[in-house]
Interface confidence: medium
């Protein structure tokens, strides 16, 4: 008689990435009896939902449901039917909604409630729909990149998991960029955190860490563009703005009450005689870094050192993981391999950003005309956040690594957040039973 | 037509529990939430906690959440409510109401089970 | 949690007056407000939502209206079979919350 495969002892879960911009929907996957090994939780499904970020519905919050249905019928598909009652499901918001419940705690608990009532609707074991802090968000961010890196593990793997991977312990740093906000987490070197906002501890597998974390609201690309735009207009003298951060021949019509509808534009905010202006681009790398260094002040710190805006940094260490939108930018300007050195970087970003906006439009035809007109800026703020902002230098860039996906799992903060929710970083290092590795063999 | 049909009256010692049901008919079950709601004598109207049953997720308010359980049956339409460890001010009726689930202008509670008492009583 | 504020809490009125409820949110509830009428030993019944939606089969002397945080119930001409406590019901958050009620008598 043949042998019957014995059913795959596996846990699901779900993560939903509601973003500045758009929401993703992660499906996890792990076999069951190695809940507590490092490693072993690989993502096995990425959706991304159709539409905007979450924050956006509050004044059409019936449709939410809508927006939600699609990704979480796939959810359905993808996990078995008869794991969908032990599936934890959990929405963590970010940025966006972080300046939503800036401008109306109760318009975003209104999101927020119709957020969780789509998703109770389904099969699932629905944990429940929040806001995650800025804290958070790096905290799990870091806490992502390095378990898929091995980092926690004390045993030496059979696997190689990346081509810049070194066979230590030290951990990496996350570089984490979103549409609303960015996050930069280390574990500095000896170094006191003189801040205690941005320092976290963690016992993780047996080890203790001491981390440093801070999260820049309104410094995600899309709203330091908007912040940059509400800048640059109050010097304008009429309403044409001529634009460095655009190619040469862009055009596009901007409107006054969008461009101050965000908290993050709210100290250049001024009465403006126009309700309309324009954006022409010039295309000018050198005059856009310049216009971009002044969103960050610099001359104030109340500490041994500082990013910007008197926010203490300690220095550099180690290797950094750059995700979400670091990678997504720099991946799009074919700038991710690690041999490109930062004034390599560099030189490349000029020649894009000066190519005229009819060359561009026909070189990358594929691409949405809205995220390919601000590639040039975004690519430039990235230098400039990376450069000015973090104080990483021509030779520390080379420690920057671009990353998408480490085994096929995306770096960001989901992973992270769920292995925290459910228990699956152990404080200690779990005994290794003779059977619990055999597959290693 | 559409109809949500309780469980008898009940008399409960403190200390018990008492389970209440509340069989739905005349619409599709899956597609409407189920809240409880209770009212003790001469009082106003306070719910207790709502589940969807296409999951069976639940919410509750939290000066219940430790002693009330939500629970449905699809296969009979039915939904549950348990109440633990109780006092003689849980004596009240309690009602099951069915509550629109997609948009968020049908959330009201649009039909009501007949309501039933329950006794707390040593 | 969203409180209601329900007032008056009773009210007595002569058959074909006009009689006014109102609701006060502690915070703007977006026009998610039901009325219910609950007569004696019976079960709430919903007369309007969303303001001020009639439910079918409900009289048209009854009515609502409002905005933000202040809402109203109006029975246009009291009729003898009106008598009932009547609650409002705020939707707007996950934590349903009911005003206290108001109990009509006819004088």
């Known amino acids: 008689t043949q042998n019957k495969a014995l059913p795959e002892n596996v846990k699901y879960g779900i993560v939903l990435d509601a973003g500045s911009s758009h929401t993703s929907l992660y499906i996890y996957k792990w076999p069951a009896e190695k809940e507590n090994d490092t490693g072993v939780v690989h993502q096995v499904e990425e959706c991304r939902v159709k539409g905007p970020g979450i924050s956006k519905f509050v004044q059409k919050v019936n449709e939410i449901g809508i927006y939600l249905t699609d990704c979480m019928e796939r959810a359905r598909e993808v996990i078995p039917r008869s794991q969908h009652q032990e599936t934890p499901v959990y929405l963590g918001a970010t940025a966006g909604m972080r300046l939503l419940r800036m401008e109306s705690e109760e318009l975003a608990d209104r999101v927020l409630d119709v957020v969780e009532r789509s998703l109770s609707n389904y099969p699932f074991d629905f944990q429940g729909a929040r806001i995650i802090t800025g804290q958070e968000e790096g905290a799990y961010g870091w806490i992502t990149i390095n378990y898929l890196l091995g980092k926690f593990s004390q045993k030496t793997r059979w696997f190689s998991i990346v081509p810049y991977e070194t066979n230590n312990q030290e951990t990496f740093g996350a570089l984490d960029l979103g549409g609303a906000s960015t996050q930069v987490t280390f574990v500095p070197q000896n170094q006191t955190i003189e801040s205690p906002d941005n320092a976290l501890q963690f016992r993780l597998y047996g080890k203790d860490y001491n981390v440093y974390t801070h999260s820049f609201l309104c410094y995600g690309k899309d709203q330091a563009l908007w912040q940059k735009l509400a800048k640059d207009i109050q010097v304008a003298s009429n309403e044409i703005l001529r634009d460095p951060c655009f190619h040469p021949g862009y055009k596009k019509v901007v409107n006054v009450s969008d461009l101050y509808k965000t908290p993050c534009t709210k100290r250049f905010e001024m009465t403006l005689p126009f309700q309309q202006f324009e954006i022409q681009g010039i295309g000018n790398y050198q005059q856009c870094h310049q216009s971009i260094l002044e969103l960050f002040n610099t001359s104030y710190c109340p500490y041994s050192q500082c990013a910007f805006n008197g926010i203490f940094l300690p220095p550099l260490q180690g290797d950094f993981g750059a995700f979400s939108a670091f990678y997504f930018v720099m991946k799009f300007l074919n700038l991710t391999s690690e041999k490109v050195s930062q004034e390599k970087v560099t030189e490349m970003m000029k020649k894009f950003c000066a190519q005229p906006w009819e060359e561009i439009k026909t070189s990358y035809a594929g691409v949405k005309e809205k995220y390919l007109s601000e590639y040039c800026f975004s690519g430039t703020y990235i230098l400039s956040l990376l450069l000015q902002g973090y104080h990483f230098t021509a030779d520390s860039w080379e420690h920057i690594h671009f990353i998408g996906k480490i085994q096929g799992s995306d770096a960001g903060w989901t992973l992270g957040y769920m292995l925290n929710l459910t228990n699956m970083i152990p404080a200690e290092q779990p005994l290794s039973t003779p059977l619990s590795h055999s597959t290693y063999v | 037509q559409v109809q949500l049909v309780q469980s008898g009256a009940e008399v409960k010692k403190p200390g018990a529990s008492v389970k209440v049901s509340c069989k739905a008919s005349g619409y599709t079950f899956t597609n409407y939430w189920m809240y409880w709601v209770r009212q003790a004598p001469g009082q106003g109207l306070e719910w207790m906690g709502r589940i969807a049953p296409s999951s069976g997720a639940t919410k509750y308010n939290e000066k219940f959440k430790n002693r009330v359980t939500l629970t449905v049956d699809t296969s009979i339409s039915t939904a549950y409510m348990e109440l633990s460890r109780l006092r003689s001010d849980d004596t009240a009726v309690y009602y099951c109401?069915?509550?629109?689930?997609?948009?968020?202008?049908?959330?009201?509670?649009?039909?009501w089970g007949q309501g039933t008492t329950v006794t707390v009583s040593s | 949690d969203i409180q209601m504020t329900q007032s008056p809490s009773s009210l007595s009125a002569s058959v074909g007056d006009r009689v006014t409820i109102t609701c006060k949110a502690s915070?703007?509830?977006?026009?998610?407000i039901g009325w219910y009428q609950q007569k004696p030993g019976k079960a709430p019944k919903l007369l309007i939502h969303?303001?001020?939606t009639l439910q079918p089969g409900v009289p048209s002397r009854f009515s609502g209206s409002g905005s933000g945080r202040d809402y109203t119930f109006t029975i246009s001409s009291l009729q003898p079979e009106d008598i009932a406590t009547y609650y409002c019901?705020?939707?707007?958050?996950?934590?349903?919350?009911f005003g206290q009620g108001t109990k009509l008598e006819i004088k």
């Open positions: 969303y303001t001020s």
């Open positions: 019901l705020q939707y707007h958050a996950l934590l349903f919350t």
């Open positions: 109401a069915r509550s629109g689930i997609y948009y968020d202008y049908d959330w009201f509670f649009d039909v």
């Open positions: 915070q703007d509830i977006n026009k998610y």
